[in-house]
């Protein structure tokens, strides 16, 4: 009966050698793809000279296979019933799933100019930067290939900077041959309701990026949740990509390849301003760009990015306040394409399908001392790209899952 099934499930979702969960956890059996759409700026001169609205045109998808590498340094700790690991990063370009090649060119914000002018706010230092920007023939915008933009290029301006700075710039640099973690998660041996929940990340229970509860590492990494998921639950998870913990709420029942799953979505409330959602007060880290914490839908993660003014949002500024998208033309947010969802099999707590969508933006501000930013009359949160990371259980795995789990219950 049900008790026997519960017992079996509890046994099989423990993260230890020999369980179904462990096998799929160490190396995901699902093919995961990350699609990128790049925002190609159509009017760079008008923006730089007249502070016009930035006209963007998204180009994509450019698709990479990701999360194909097995977890590394997997170490069980019998004393506190945890397992620690590193999640290695790797990306392989998939030409057949892409609209072009990694050599395609895009006009994008000059990442180094925007970041340096934000990090070094001293007026005299900005004059020095101005001289180097001009000497290197850099501007507010630049033309870069997809490969350069994502994975890194040697920046000509930074190469002249007399400070000891990293001269390689890229939105995901460094990526290949790096790893995320160390994660230490509960293996569920002593308490199945804690399985996969993160105990520590990089040796700590908090991030040191935010104040108060915003700084906590909550829940799992979203690949799985403790079993017997209820529709009423708020599922907490941590995403190192956005340097914070976030949550998902039940939206609908979905049938995935014959398996009943619960679709959990990230609600607009998670991106709301503290005015609408007081819990979010600690994600508002400054008062000017956020218009005294009334703006919403963008997250300043600069503390997590060595001071670089990176802002994370949903694609096309979905769920963001009008003031954020007002200076940008060419955006068309819609929930179906741009929200994040997780399809969770409720008995095991396994995420069998997901779509993680986010947008990477960079803040650029007027600067009296930097000539290429001098004519700007306002701050811009400039969209650089958005991504859609997806994974769906394979047909073979789905058949096995149906026969071993859901079939036995139904």
């Amino acid at each position: 009966g049900d008790l026997l099934i519960q017992k079996t499930i509890k046994k099989q979702v423990v993260l230890e050698e020999g369980t179904i969960a462990f096998k799929n956890w160490v190396k995901t059996g699902t093919e995961v793809y990350r699609q990128f759409w790049i925002f190609d700026v159509q009017n760079p001169q008008e923006v730089m000279m007249n502070s016009s609205n930035i006209q963007v045109k998204q180009r994509g998808p450019y698709t990479y296979r990701v999360r194909f590498l097995a977890k590394e340094n997997v170490t069980q700790d019998a004393e506190d019933n945890t397992v620690s690991f590193l999640q290695p990063n790797g990306a392989i370009f998939e030409p057949s799933l892409s609209v072009g090649t990694e050599a395609d060119n895009f006009t994008v914000l000059n990442l180094a100019v925007a970041a340096a002018s934000h990090i070094y706010q001293n007026q005299f230092v900005q004059m020095i930067l101005n001289s180097l920007i001009n000497k290197s023939k850099s501007s507010m915008f630049q033309v870069r290939t997809l490969r350069e933009l994502l994975w890194g290029y040697r920046d000509p301006f930074l190469s002249l900077v007399p400070y000891p700075v990293t001269t390689t710039v890229g939105l995901f640099y460094p990526y290949n041959n790096t790893a995320d973690g160390v994660y230490k998660v509960f293996n569920g041996k002593d308490n199945i309701s804690k399985v996969a929940i993160i105990d520590t990340y990089k040796g700590k229970r908090n991030l040191s990026y935010w104040e108060s509860h915003c700084d906590m590492i909550n829940g799992t990494d979203a690949a799985s949740f403790p079993p017997f998921v209820e529709k009423s639950q708020v599922l907490q998870f941590f995403s190192s990509d956005i340097c914070r913990s976030i949550y998902a709420v039940f939206e609908s029942d979905v049938n995935l390849k014959g398996i009943p799953v619960y679709r959990f979505v990230l609600p607009s409330k998670a991106f709301a301003s503290p005015v609408e959602n007081p819990d979010n007060y600690c994600f508002c880290t400054e008062k000017i760009i956020s218009k005294n914490c009334t703006s919403y839908g963008v997250l300043d993660i600069s503390k997590c990015k060595e001071g670089r003014p990176v802002y994370i949002s949903l694609p096309h500024f979905l769920y963001a306040s009008p003031d954020v998208s007002e200076p940008i033309d060419g955006l068309n947010p819609n929930e179906e394409e741009h929200r994040t969802y997780l399809d969770i099999e409720p008995i095991t707590g396994f995420t069998l399908q997901f779509a993680k969508r986010l947008q990477v933006n960079l803040l650029v501000k007027p600067s009296e001392k930097i000539q290429v930013l001098k004519n700007l009359k306002r701050n811009y949160i400039v969209p650089i790209l958005w991504l859609n990371e997806t994974g769906t259980i394979g047909d073979e795995k789905a058949n096995m899952f149906r026969s071993q789990v859901t079939g036995k219950i139904n």
């Epitope: 001293n122 007026q123 005299f124 230092v125 004059m127 020095i128 101005n130 001289s131 180097l132 001009n134 000497k135 007399p162 400070y163 009296e368 001392k369 000539q371 001098k374």
Partner: antibody
Framework: QVQLQQPGTELVKPGASVKLSCKAS????????MHWVKQRPGQGLEWIGE????????NYNQKFKGKATLTVDKSSSTAYMQLSSLTSEDSAVYYC?????????WGQGTTLTVSS | DIVLTQSQKFMSTSVGDRVSVTCKAS??????VAWYQQKPGQSPKALIY???YRYSGVPDRFTGSGSGTDFTLTISNVQSEDLAEYFC?????????FGGGTKLEIK
């Protein structure tokens, strides 16, 4: 090779005005802010102000507002500083210096003597 | 205005010695300090920026240190060509100000 040509000396009478020049070569004149610094004989250095040659935007040390006026002529890559209502206190060496990572390229300076 | 005090107007040293020139700011200027060398009859030359970074071409016997309000320029293994006046400058806030200078004399 960055070069800044300043006249060696200027002799003017009290109450008069003088326009000191600084002709730049060896770099893109409009790309670098130009600073002016005063040094009285046997004394320290005083920052007067700065000008962006690309659009003539200026910032002054409050102490020199009304005394010094900074301008540029882009066509000849020359920066100017006009000093008005001169007194003996204005007798000094005046340096121009473009900001390329720091005040490391200074002109040789113009020695201004205010005397009747 | 931020006042930079170089308490020693003159310093006497011998070739091969090590000498430290100090500069004290009237308020916190972070590391936004530069050091200049002015030889007799010449215009100043920049040695150090951001309190501790040498300009290219500056011999490594010149070392800058300090942050906040206290800064030091150290010349190790003094050479005869180091006979000069040394000025500190803050560029933390307008107006940029200079110290009164320290003259280095070689015995």
């Amino acid at each position: 090779q960055v070069q800044l040509q300043q006249p060696g000396t200027e002799l003017v009478k009290p109450g008069a005005s003088v326009k000191l020049s600084c002709k730049a070569s060896g770099y893109t004149f409009t790309s670098y802010w130009m600073h002016w610094v005063k040094q009285r004989p046997g004394q320290g250095l005083e920052w007067i102000g700065e000008i962006d040659p690309s659009d003539s935007h200026t910032n002054y040390n409050q102490k020199f507002k009304g005394k010094a006026t900074l301008t540029v002529d882009k066509s000849s890559s020359t920066a100017y500083m006009q000093l008005s209502s001169l007194t003996s206190e204005d007798s000094a060496v005046y340096y121009c210096a473009p900001i390329y990572y720091g005040l490391d390229n200074w002109g040789q300076g113009t020695t201004l003597t205010v005397s009747s | 205005d931020i006042v930079l005090t170089q308490s020693q107007k003159f310093m006497s040293t011998s070739v091969g010695d090590r000498v430290s020139v100090t500069c004290k700011a009237s308020q916190n200027v972070g590391t936004n300090v530069a050091w200049y060398q002015q030889k007799p009859g010449q215009s100043p030359k920049a040695l150090i920026y951001s309190a501790s970074y040498r300009y290219s071409g500056v011999p490594d016997r010149f070392t800058g240190s300090g942050s906040g309000t206290d800064f030091t320029l150290t010349i190790s293994n003094v050479q005869s060509e180091d006979l000069a006046e040394y000025f500190c400058q803050q560029y933390n806030s307008y107006p940029y100000t200079f110290g009164g200078g320290t003259k280095l004399e070689i015995k």
